[in-house]
């Protein structure tokens, strides 16, 4: 195989651009989801976000986030998720294990799942971008 070592493949400005794009798309998704009135956030769902034992951007739980967003896509046809998934795939190693998500079957519970995960995803991308930029600052000092 002629694949170069991973560290040679992707300049940090690309990673930052990917995460910035994800952050922007996460806000679009949340805005769309929040238009549904009378839905409350649930404590039953937690989106894995950053891993403390890895360096950015590998500290982002991209495969798990992808699986959660794929579940939202199945429950509610939000086209912005297609673009989110394409960008997450830029951060996911091709041999990363699959994550299985149990899909809520009740309509109201589905709406709570969508709102909760969308909110957590938006917060996660804010954190991811912060971790990237602070990591970049540490690398230059």
């Amino acid at each position: 195989s002629h694949t170069l070592p991973v560290r040679l493949l992707r300049p940090s400005d690309d990673v930052q651009k990917i995460v910035e794009e994800l952050q922007s798309l996460s806000k679009m998704l949340l805005k769309d989801v929040e238009e549904e009135k009378g839905v409350l956030v649930s404590q039953n769902y937690t989106l894995p976000c950053l891993s403390p034992d890895a360096q950015p951007p590998n500290n982002i739980h991209s495969p798990a986030i992808r699986a959660y967003l794929k579940t939202i896509r199945q429950l509610d046809n939000k086209s912005v998720i297609d673009e989110i998934i394409e960008h997450l795939d830029k951060l996911i190693f091709q041999d990363a294990p699959e994550t299985n998500i149990s899909v809520p079957t009740d309509t109201h519970e589905s709406k709570r799942f969508i709102l909760t995960i969308s909110q957590q995803f938006s917060e996660c991308m804010d954190l991811a971008l912060k971790s990237l930029t602070s990591g970049a600052q540490q690398a230059t000092t």
């Epitope: 493949l9 690309d14 990917i18 297609d82 960008h87 795939d89 830029k90």
Partner: antibody, heavy 122, light 107 residues
């Protein structure tokens, strides 16, 4: 080494459909996007769509939406591209292509099928 | 959709000449750009991926570079076997559009 083998040439009548297959071998990755591209005689390359076979997730060019369907059979490592309501302008060579690299997203298509010529004529 | 504007559409150069082909993306696509070579009647062949990484077995006279949203394929010393049409393709977000192609001929 990845190999992509496509189905043979087809001659079709206007208004009919064609289904082209692309069988992949020699790879172990599960997370990848495979694309379909066509090239009309004397013309450039035109992106038609892509599939993420692990989930059957698809993306289509707006130009072909509603006329093209891309599917994959994981058990046989075969992808399919079906184009319906054929017209003479669909006469082209159709290619499938497959990426290499450490990420699920592509940044170049390293492997290409040999191409399938589809002729649409009454 | 992201547009890829490729120029020139054709060029004629002498053996040994330095040849440059440019693709301009309608928005920032990072390094998510590939270059292909297609000889008449043949399958496209990947030359450069990730804007500037050479694919396996590609002669060193082919190189890729990027400046903002402008991407350049350079053939440092044109050879007779380089007669072909060259295409760029972006992979930022679908649709993964191609440039219109550049036909390279020998003078």
């Amino acid at each position: 080494q990845v190999q992509l083998v496509q189905s043979g040439a087809e001659v079709k009548k206007p208004g009919s459909s064609v289904k082209v297959s692309c069988k992949a071998s020699g790879y172990t990755r599960t997370r990848y996007w495979m694309q379909w591209v066509r090239q009309a005689p004397g013309q450039g390359l035109e992106w038609m769509g892509a599939i993420y076979p692990a989930e059957g997730d698809t993306r289509y060019s707006q130009k072909f939406k509603g006329r093209v369907t891309i599917t994959a059979d994981k058990s046989t490592s075969t992808a399919y591209m079906e184009l319906s309501s054929l017209r003479s302008e669909d006469t082209a060579v159709y290619y499938c292509a497959f990426p290499e690299g450490p990420y699920a997203a592509p940044y170049g298509m390293h492997y290409w099928g040999q191409g399938t010529t589809v002729t649409v004529s009454s | 959709a992201i547009q890829m504007t490729q120029s020139p559409s054709s060029l004629s150069a002498s053996v040994g000449d330095r040849v440059t082909i440019t693709c301009r993306a309608s928005r920032n696509i990072g390094n998510y750009l590939a270059w292909y070579q297609q000889k008449p009647g043949k399958v496209p062949k990947l030359l450069i991926y990730y804007a500037k990484t050479s694919a396996s077995g590609v002669p060193s006279r082919f190189s890729g570079s990027r400046s903002g949203t402008d991407y350049t394929l350079t053939i440092s010393s044109l050879q007779p076997e380089d007669v072909a049409t060259y295409y760029c393709q972006h992979f930022w977000s679908t649709p993964w559009t191609f440039g219109g192609g550049t036909k390279v001929e020998i003078k």
